[in-house]
């Protein structure tokens, strides 16, 4: 059974994941982002089901494509590069989903834009956090 300290750690990790997903979305939704139209042409796979931590496997599998799309931003000056954000997200995802069991991700038939994709995983984090608090 999960202890109170392990639940707290999970909650904190989910909050950090949530913050960085929201950070990425903020940058994409910035009305001054000239690459937004191009970014929206790329399609992402969405999970058929995302209700448990093991379903983060579906997010992990889309992190490389996500980084590639974020690289389109090509800002003159990055506070954080796309690879910094994706690297941190990857570490958190691996810790949260664990590596004990291999879960085969099932994807929905419909693909999504980067904005829909990020919103889906933001909602996932918020939902899991709400069950832990």
């Amino acid at each position: 059974a999960p202890t109170s300290s392990s639940t707290k750690k999970t909650q904190l990790q989910l909050e950090h994941l949530l913050l960085d997903l929201q950070m990425i979305l903020n940058g994409i939704n910035n009305y001054k982002n000239p690459k937004l139209t191009r970014m929206l042409t790329f399609k992402f796979y969405m999970p058929k089901k995302a209700t448990e931590l093991k379903h983060l496997q579906c997010l992990e599998e889309e992190l490389k494509p996500l980084e590639e799309v974020l690289n389109l931003a090509q800002s003159k000056n990055f506070h954080l590069r796309p690879r910094d954000l994706i690297s941190n997200i990857n570490v958190i995802v691996l810790e949260l989903k664990g590596s004990e069991t291999t879960f085969m991700c099932e994807y929905a038939d419909e693909t999504a834009t980067i904005v829909e994709f990020l919103n889906r995983w933001i909602t996932f984090c918020q939902s899991i956090i709400s069950t832990l608090t």
């Epitope: 950090h16 994941l17 913050l19 960085d20 950070m23 903020n26 000056n77 590069r81």
Partner: nanobody, 119 residues
């Protein structure tokens, strides 16, 4: 409006350490990047290190392994622990606060704190 207050600068000998702090106040959001930039006389401002509220970090190659950036989300404060300081680290260090991972005109900047590495 966001206000940034930096502290911790000073004179230190080569090989020494300093810890810079930057506290943000005002219209603070939970989603942010805070970082440290520096400008030496006659040079352009350059990134030293940055950190997101979610924990993503970015370091300039010249400071990797010597400097560590950390943050306290509850206090809206970012810290820069600088070890093994070199004379070439001498500069004015500026704190930055941004709501996006890339620089734009909505970013806020501190007044700067002088770091001098000299024997």
């Amino acid at each position: 409006e966001v206000q940034l207050v930096e502290s911790g600068g000073g004179l230190v000998q080569p090989g020494g350490s300093l810890r810079l702090s930057c506290a943000a106040s005002g219209s603070i959001f939970s989603i942010y990047v805070m970082g440290w930039y520096r400008q030496a006389p006659g040079k352009q401002r350059e990134l030293v290190a940055a950190i997101s509220s979610g924990g993503s970090t970015n370091y300039a190659d010249s400071v990797k392994g010597r400097f560590t950036i950390s943050r306290d989300n509850a206090k809206n404060t970012v810290y820069l622990q600088m070890n093994s300081l070199k004379p070439e680290d001498t500069a004015v260090y500026y704190c930055a606060y941004a709501s996006s991972w890339y620089e734009d005109e909505t970013d806020y900047w501190g007044q700067g704190t002088q770091v001098t590495v000299s024997s």
